[in-house]
């Protein structure tokens, strides 16, 4: 891996499973400030695999909403507006981490947790072709 | 919000900011036991939308590597095998939480960040119609 | 009516330097980012310079970097593409998108329908 060297002026650890346990500052910092969200807001309604999106609660886990993406269909919308079953409709899922609260119920101790979650939908040609 | 009871075992926090600093632990409960990782790894080929995935790398940043997806065409792929400009590939993209060193360089002191990621790309009929 | 126009092609030298316009008409242009594509003959579409809806950043392509650069004008609702130092490897159809850069900034993918391009040939 990359070593980094050690900035003298680092907090120090007084934990013994250092660095197992680290410090971590919860004031998010935001990087999008270059996007457009509506831009992308729609391509849930105008995908030829579109999907709902369902809300998914867990007050024991930070960020506590996590958005799951549901395909409406089996197949994708071809030219015409209807269900083409000759293709699929697919969730693409990406494996992201959170925070578990750990002990349950500590408002300041966590343990990191990856979780998968289906971000969209793509259409995608069948893996197996039925032959006659 | 959830008001969640406090656990009486909860580790005490001597920082003055709390609970805007909090103790995480880095050992990764991994809750995608259940999940075939080989699924949807080929639907970057499969889709009617692909995509290649370019590795982005921050030695500052925990996960430290993070795939992002680029689509392969402007237009998205049709029954023939061609590329069809009357829709559009597109990336589908998530907030994700990341840690960020801070101080820079420090091995056990973080801070959460929010990044926008290209998890995959979805075929869209365009946003803006050009009449003849 | 919605409408993205592009004009300013022609038969050019190598070497010498031609200015593409987009117009839009029927949505102003500032809310969205737009792109320059080109297609030569036998070839894919490919993104040569886009800029930003947001913050108005800019992506070039390796190819052209240096030699082309894009613009917009919200008040004429018009983006622009400067080509100087033209090649004849730049001889393509060249179109105008509404587009957007990716986070990685490696390119630029489109949100909308073409026009009828105009036709850029570089040759003596």
């Known amino acids: 891996g990359i070593t980094i060297p050690r900035n003298p002026g680092c907090p120090n650890s007084e934990d013994k499973n250092f660095p197992r346990t680290v410090m971590v500052n919860l004031n998010i910092h935001n990087r999008n400030t270059n996007t457009n969200p509506k831009r992308s807001s729609d391509y849930y309604n105008r995908s030829t695999s579109p999907w709902n999106l369902h809300r998914n609660e867990d007050p024991e886990r930070y960020p506590s909403v996590i958005w799951e993406a549901k395909c409406r269909h089996l197949g994708c919308i071809n030219a015409d507006g209807n269900v083409d079953y000759h293709m699929n409709s697919v969730p693409i899922q990406q494996e992201i981490l959170v925070l578990r609260r750990e002990p349950p119920h500590c408002p300041n101790s966590f343990r990191l947790e990856k979780i998968l979650v289906s971000v969209g939908c793509t259409c995608v040609t069948p893996i197996v072709h039925h032959v006659a | 919000g959830i008001t969640i009871p406090r656990n009486p075992g909860c580790p005490n926090s001597e920082d003055k900011n709390f609970p805007r600093t909090v103790m995480v632990n880095l050992n990764i409960h991994n809750r995608n036991t259940n999940t075939n990782p080989k699924r949807s790894s080929d639907y970057y080929n499969r889709s009617t939308s692909p995509w290649n995935l370019h590795r982005n790398e921050d030695p500052e940043r925990y996960p430290s590597v993070i795939w992002e997806a680029k689509c392969r065409h402007l237009g998205c792929i049709n029954a023939d095998g061609n590329v069809d400009y009357h829709m559009n590939s597109v990336p589908i993209q998530q907030e994700i939480l990341v840690l960020r060193r801070e101080p820079p360089h420090c091995p056990n002191s973080f801070r959460l960040e929010k990044i926008l990621v290209s998890v995959g790309c979805t075929c869209v009929t365009p946003i803006v119609h050009h009449v003849a | 009516e919605v409408r993205l126009v592009e004009s300013g092609g022609g038969l050019v030298q190598p070497g010498g330097s031609l200015r593409l316009s987009c117009a839009a008409s029927?949505?102003?242009?500032?809310?969205?980012?737009i792109g320059w594509f080109r297609q030569a003959p036998g070839k894919e579409r490919e993104g040569v310079s886009c800029?930003?809806?947001?913050?108005?950043?800019?992506y070039y392509a390796d190819s052209v970097k240096g030699r082309f650069t894009i613009s917009r004008d919200n008040a004429k609702n018009t983006v622009y593409l400067q080509m100087n130092s033209l090649k004849p490897e730049d001889t393509a159809v060249y179109y105008c998108?509404?587009?957007?850069?990716?986070?990685?900034?490696?390119?630029?993918?489109?949100?909308?329908?073409w026009g009828q391009g105009t036709q850029v040939t570089v040759s003596s």
């Open positions: 800029i930003s809806s947001s913050d108005g950043s800019t």
């Open positions: 029927g949505f102003t242009l500032d809310y969205y980012g």
């Open positions: 998108a509404v587009a957007e850069i990716y986070l990685s900034g490696y390119g630029c993918y489109v949100d909308g329908s």
